[in-house]
């Protein structure tokens, strides 16, 4: 990948990722330097007859670093702080080729929950106020609420009225997703409204 347009690579928190390195065809490589955010990560000297010399120069990522046979960088047990700019410089007798990468770390979504703040009106109509959440949500998480295949909300929150006298049983499903995972959680309008009704009659007595 040329230095002008970095290759964007997605990694998943806790998993592994490979930054692929392409070699100049038919040229003998003298050495390869890998950099992270302009700081040296590793210095590799290939040998034709024996194993390459690999000098890991960044102790912070050192234990999680590995290199493939083609000197692509493998990073395991990914952490959020691995996010950033990576560069590989391949030096031959005649030239230096630069490859650039941008690594972003995405979280597998976990622990989807729905909280409910519903109320019952005098006419027995139940107004549902539902809020969906996932652990450590960031701006890359998309939320939506669906019922019978229709999207009712594109936000973590859903406000909807449900009348048990005219509506059949209805499930509302929150879907949370990002580029690497999705979770869903369904709630029953009938169940939620029954709970509210019990609270309502308890307070009336």
């Amino acid at each position: 990948q040329s230095s002008l347009t970095p290759l964007m690579v997605n990694g998943i928190l806790g998993e592994s990722v490979t930054l692929p390195l392409e070699f100049p065809a038919g040229e003998k490589v003298n050495f390869i330097t890998w950099l992270f955010n302009e700081t040296s990560l590793a210095f590799i000297v290939p040998h034709e007859t024996k194993s390459p010399e690999i000098h890991v120069t960044n102790p912070k990522q050192g234990k999680r670093l590995n290199f493939t046979q083609s000197y692509s960088l493998q990073l395991s047990n990914l952490k959020m702080e691995d996010t950033g700019s990576y560069r590989a410089q391949i030096s031959t007798k005649t030239s230096a080729k630069l490859s650039s990468y941008t690594l972003r770390i995405l979280r597998q979504l976990r622990n989807i929950q729905v909280t409910n703040h519903s109320q019952l009106f005098q006419n027995m109509t139940c107004e549902l106020h539902l809020t969906c959440s996932v652990e450590d949500a960031d701006d890359n998480v998309s939320f939506r609420w669906e019922a019978l295949g229709n999207t009712l909300s594109s936000q973590p929150n859903l406000t909807v009225s449900w009348d048990p006298r005219i509506s059949s049983e209805q499930d509302y499903t929150c879907i949370a997703e990002n580029a690497v995972s999705n979770l869903s959680f369904s709630v029953s309008a009938q169940k939620l409204c029954e709970d509210v009704k019990i609270q309502y009659t308890d307070t009336k007595m």
Epitope: N10, R104, S153, L158, T159, I175, A179
Partner: antibody, heavy 118, light 106 residues
């Protein structure tokens, strides 16, 4: 039917402020996020950010942090875009767009053209 | 941010012809949306989540793709299809649009 109607064209001087409105009808306003998109003359579309119409919390793309402000008037089902200290590069058509989920913009506003000229 | 590159920038086709335009992402994305825009008008939703046609979009349109490569195909171009088509990704903030493919009818 569902529609987003925006305020009319604006002619402003550099340094002035403009506030564009986007009135929604035909759906529950507070259930769908509202996005703002910029299109400079002869250019492509640029996402400016969005506002959560339930909580009122805005989120801005990096290029639109500072002079730009999203706001709501929930009782009027209306979203607003305000641009402060107008610059020549703000000259564009601005669209509001409803997010149907996964940032798919299923309904677009009529567009408001902002001209900046001294 | 994820950069979307659309090609070709301008596509010229005769009525009845099959055409394909592509959208390449600088990083893998899970879905792509497409919009149609005609001069002086607001963009219209055209294809969502890679392959689903928006309401009212003729069946001659289709969308496909995965990872970093997506495409919009028109099986038999008609005069009313003349417009600029934009792709848009949702996987990463900021949401980004491609530079557009302008379809001209001969």
């Amino acid at each position: 039917q569902i529609q987003l109607v925006q305020s009319g064209p604006e002619l402003k001087k550099p340094g002035e402020t403009v506030k564009i409105s986007c009135k929604a009808s035909g759906y529950t306003f507070t259930n769908y996020g509202m996005n703002w998109v910029k299109q400079a003359p002869g250019k492509d579309l640029k996402w400016m950010g969005w506002i959560n119409t339930y909580s009122g919390e805005p989120r801005y793309a990096d290029d639109f942090k500072g002079r730009f402000a999203f706001s709501l008037e929930k009782s009027a089902n209306t979203a607003y875009l305000q641009i402060n200290n107008l610059k020549n590069e703000d000259m564009a058509t601005y669209f509001c767009a409803r997010d149907y989920g996964r940032w798919y913009f299923d309904v677009w506003g009529t567009g408001t053209t902002v001209t900046v000229s001294s | 941010q994820i950069v979307l590159s659309q090609s070709p920038a301008i596509l010229s086709a005769s009525p009845g012809e099959k055409v394909t335009m592509t959208c390449r992402a600088s990083s893998s994305v899970s879905h792509m949306h497409w919009y149609q825009q005609k001069p002086g008008s607001s963009p219209k939703p055209w294809i969502y989540a890679t392959s689903n046609l928006a309401s009212g979009v003729p069946a001659r349109f289709s969308g496909s793709g995965s990872g970093t490569s997506y495409s919009l195909t028109i099986s038999r171009v008609e005069a009313e299809d003349a417009a600029t088509y934009y792709c848009q990704q949702w996987s990463s903030t900021p949401r980004t649009f491609g530079g557009g493919t302008k379809l001209e009818i001969k």
